[in-house]
């Protein structure tokens, strides 16, 4: 597999440092290549674990830049995929350079949940909206999904009040607290003047990958009135 | 196992024709024995399948009659048991005579269900009471029992009306129709003067053994009045 | 009476399994099945029991005198345990046929281990709604 | 992160199961598990899968370099699949250890066949009441 792609012993150098980065389920392959007198073009192929006839599938063909978005080639984000890149200069092709095994769910990053905070009677209601990811151009939430093991299993919610911080945990599979759009957390408020500041992060099932932490949102309670 | 029970070559004849009969879960062992100048006594032993340390257990010791009630030695009536009988004359013992494999549920007989019949509005209600059996001295119904595969799975109910007979089937596991005491069947009645005669039999799960058929009970409908 | 009963009695004769010494040293399956009432626990145990019988029947596949009995029993097992569902039976058979000494099978098994483990606990009993637009489908 | 994850990644290195050729010829278990949503169907399949892993681990019991990983994973399997219930695990292990070529085991299996078959279909889903005084208890 590390031999030449087509022709005999090749004078075309192999791409180096093939890496994959993923943000919100959008994996992009990067590689490096030495400066050549003639402009090289690259072909990127992807192989997925768990596809019936697992073969190397073309993701980008004869491109000149050094990256390739392979999000259309991701099946179950818990499954592994591998990438290989070859260079072509004129009629000659290099050997393939291969990536390490990559699993979008294990090795990628997920953006933060969005937060909303409001006062209702004697409690503060916190809405935690599941992070949105773009899959095949569709915006979707990283909600519990019986079809994959890649979903946010728990939210860590950090509540600061007058300097002291309490951490709450919300299990996303508990239907009382969560639906496919958001989770809710109710916090009783004391009657004192207090500022409540809240941030949250999700923890993905299996690999325990943590999403980015949300920006802190605050609410101030004056006796029983509210100042956002 | 067919050798002598204690002493050397025995001149004491072996019992013959060891058979088991069971009615309403009460198995009794019978055997035959030749006439002897000295009165013989018999020991009956039982071995059950499914008992942890399966050994021959004494059921009747040194009895002079030719039968032995072994109902205290029945575990799950679906499980097999075997019986062996030896004779003793004075100090000498015979070899054991052994029964065939016997399963109370497969090889025994069960008495009939009891029936009750009455008219309610525009239908006849038939109550089918599960046959009673005596297990370890306790009266119990042959109701569906998740602890054993030996229970009445279905009742065949035969309804005769003016010469023609219809057969109904009642599944005992359907809670709408049955409980631990009885099953119920509702039959719509025509407005004509008619006599309805009903009998029923149970069919046991697995071996499909049929209980005895109940006596026929009848009810006569005059327009909308009843004569039992 | 289900068709398997007569054929199983026939097999008992063939294997001399109606003799009293068969009772020695307890039961194989019946005692274990008595321990588990919960349907999913029963299926865990029955899965092993059924695969044992299929292996046993395979060992006697060349014995013509019991072929009809074996086929009838297998058929009834497929009806009762697999609900006559050929796909369920085929998937089950694939699993029972994997060779634990095959290097490629070993590597695949280890590769899949994390995801298999992640699914071992029963799914949350919430009857959790399924999104109309499912996530992460490739 | 559950303890098994790190140890399973360790096993992947040991078995070279992270290389792309491991993807050839489809999945062993994951594809099958995707087919079955119903909890009892999943248990039928998972029962076979778990017994496969236990056999695989047994084959490598003398390999000291992966013993800690294997033990951690087995422990986590016991927690997840057997709900930390030792009796369940023991019954399961008994079933997986019966030898299909042992004559006494064969005879017992055939003796028990009728009753095993009678219990194969799921119990009536009625939540049927259980009598206080159970029938036929020996």
């Amino acid at each position: 597999e590390m031999g030449t792609a087509d022709l005999g012993p090749s004078s075309v150098p192999t791409p180096t440092n093939v890496t994959i980065e993923s943000y919100n389920m959008n994996p992009i392959v990067y590689w490096e290549y030495q400066i050549m007198p003639q402009v090289p073009v690259f072909t990127v192929e992807v192989k997925n674990y768990g596809v019936k006839n697992s073969e190397w599938i073309d993701a980008c063909i004869n491109i000149s830049h050094h990256y390739c978005n392979i999000s259309d080639h991701v099946g179950d984000p818990s499954n592994s995929l591998w990438v290989r890149v070859k260079a072509r200069v004129g009629q000659k092709e290099s050997a393939y350079a291969k990536s390490e095994e990559f699993a979008v769910c294990r090795d990628g990053k997920i953006g933060p949940p969005k937060l909303d905070i409001r006062k209702e009677e004697k409690q503060i209601m916190i809405d935690i909206f599941h992070p949105s990811v773009f899959v095949n151009g569709d915006e979707q939430e990283v909600d519990y999904d019986p079809e994959t093991t890649c979903y946010i299993r728990v939210y860590n919610v950090y509540v600061r009040m007058n300097g002291s911080e309490i951490q709450y945990k919300i299990l996303t599979q508990k239907e009382d607290d969560c639906d496919e759009i958001q989770c809710q957390l109710a916090i009783p408020v004391s009657s004192l003047n207090s500022q409540y500041c809240v941030s949250a992060e999700g923890v993905l099932h299996v690999w325990g990958v943590t999403t980015e932490k949300s920006k802190e949102v605050c609410i101030t309670i004056f006796n029983s009135s509210i100042k956002g | 196992e067919m050798g002598t029970a204690d002493l050397g070559p025995s001149s004491v004849p072996t019992p013959t024709n060891v058979t088991i009969e069971s009615y309403n879960m009460n198995p009794i062992v019978y055997w035959e024995y030749q006439i002897m100048p000295q009165v013989p006594v018999f020991t009956v032993e039982v071995k059950n399948y499914g008992v942890k340390n399966s050994e021959w257990i004494d059921a009747c010791i040194n009895i002079s009659h030719h039968y032995c009630n072994i109902s205290d030695h029945v575990g799950d009536p679906s499980n097999s048991l075997w019986v062996r009988v030896k004779a003793r004359v004075g100090q000498k013992e015979s070899a054991y005579a052994k029964s065939e494999e016997f399963a109370v549920c497969r090889d025994g007989k069960i008495g009939p269900p009891k029936l009750d019949i009455r008219k309610e509005e525009k239908q006849i209600m038939i109550d089918i009471f599960h046959p009673s059996v005596f297990v370890n001295g306790d009266e119990q119904e042959v109701d569906y029992d998740p602890e054993t595969t030996c229970y009445i799975r279905v009742y065949n109910v035969y309804v005769r009306m003016n010469g023609s007979e219809i057969q109904y089937k009642i599944l005992t596991q359907k809670e709408d129709d049955c409980d631990e005491i009885q099953c119920q069947l509702a039959i719509p009645v025509s407005s004509l003067n008619s006599q309805y005669c009903v009998s029923a039999e149970g069919v046991l799960h697995v071996w499909g053994v049929t209980t005895e058929k109940s006596k026929e009970v009848c009810i006569t409908i005059f327009n909308s009045s009843i004569k039992g | 009476q289900d068709p398997y009963v007569k054929e199983a009695e026939n097999l008992k004769k063939y294997f001399n399994a109606g003799h009293s010494d068969v009772a020695d040293n307890g039961t194989l399956f019946l005692g274990i099945l008595k321990n588990w009432k919960e349907e999913s626990d029963r299926k865990i145990m029955q899965s092993q029991i059924v695969s044992f019988y299929f292996k046993l029947f395979k060992n006697f596949k060349d014995d013509q005198s019991i072929q009809k009995s074996v086929e009838t029993i297998k058929e009834d097992m497929n009806v009762k345990f697999f609900n006559s569902n050929k796909k369920k039976r085929d998937d089950f058979e694939k699993l029972t046929n994997y060779s634990v000494t095959d290097l490629n099978v070993q590597r695949k098994a280890i590769h899949e281990l994390i995801q298999v483990m992640a699914e071992l606990s029963p799914a949350a009993k919430t009857g959790k709604r399924k999104r109309s637009q499912m996530l992460f489908r490739g | 992160q559950d303890p098994y994850v790190k140890e399973a990644e360790n096993l992947k290195k040991y078995f070279n199961a992270g290389h792309s050729d491991v993807a050839d010829n489809g999945t062993l278990f994951l594809g099958i598990l995707k087919n079955w949503k119903e909890e009892s169907d999943r248990k039928i399949m998972q029962s076979q899968i778990v017994s496969f892993y236990f056999k695989l681990f047994k084959n490598f019991k003398d390999d000291q370099s992966i013993q800690k990983s294997v033990e951690t994973i087995k422990e986590d399997m016991n927690v997840k699949f057997f709900n930390s219930n030792k009796k369940k695990r023991d019954d399961f292990e008994k079933l997986t250890n019966y030898s299909v070529t042992d004559l006494n085991v064969q005879r017992k299996a055939i003796h028990e066949l009728i009753q095993v078959m009678a219990e194969l279909s799921p119990a009536a889903k009625t939540g049927k009441r259980k009598r206080s005084q159970m029938l036929f208890r020996g």
């Epitope: - | - | 058929e75 009806v79 569902n85 796909k87 | -």
Partner: antibody, heavy 123, light 112 residues
Amino acid sequence: EVQLLESGGGLVQPGGSLRLSCAASGFTFSSYAMSWVRQAPGKGLEWVSAISGSGGSTYYADSVKGRFTISRDNSKNTLYLQMNSLRAEDTAVYYCAKDGSSGWYVPHWFDPWGQGTLVTVSS
Amino acid sequence: NFMLTQPHSVSESPGKTVTISCTRSSGSIASNYVQWYQQRPGSSPTTVIYEDNQRPSGVPDRFSGSIDSSSNSASLTISGLKTEDEADYYCQSYDGSNRWMFGGGTKLTVLG
């Protein structure tokens, strides 16, 4: 080559009866489950009835249960469908079909199909 | 009982690829095999895909079948369309309680 040849169709009045036959050749008839599938004029396919290879198990669609009876004679390699209490909505081409996979006692998929026989129920 | 829903009709030009879907109304599409039958006008049905994705011998590899659990549907894909592919296509599955269900059928028109 596997061949299935249906016969016995025709015009019958509502409430009447008809018996369809399907003569099979080119395979071990008793090893395969068999089925009847029908197709009303201009409409889709509807499974009607099935029978196991031995003939011991039979299955019916709700729409024909109690009126139709499937049977087979393995010595004659023939499948039958006895149709009683016929209704206008039973009008269709009736196909006999062999199970596509042997050794599975309920049909699993249908292959091949016969050429069909037309049953018309009309007064 | 579940239903299998197919589009009434699809059309595409020769040489192109067409996909016909078959959506199961309840229960999992993956838990029983799905078959696909082709019925040309005036002829009996013939199998083009069995057991989700298997092709009988004699059926060209332009025909492929797949299952998508997320949409609870099966698909028949025909690539390199030819005029002879013009026909009605039916999906079929078993319902787990001794009934065999067919989809309503899809009329494929090859344009031109």
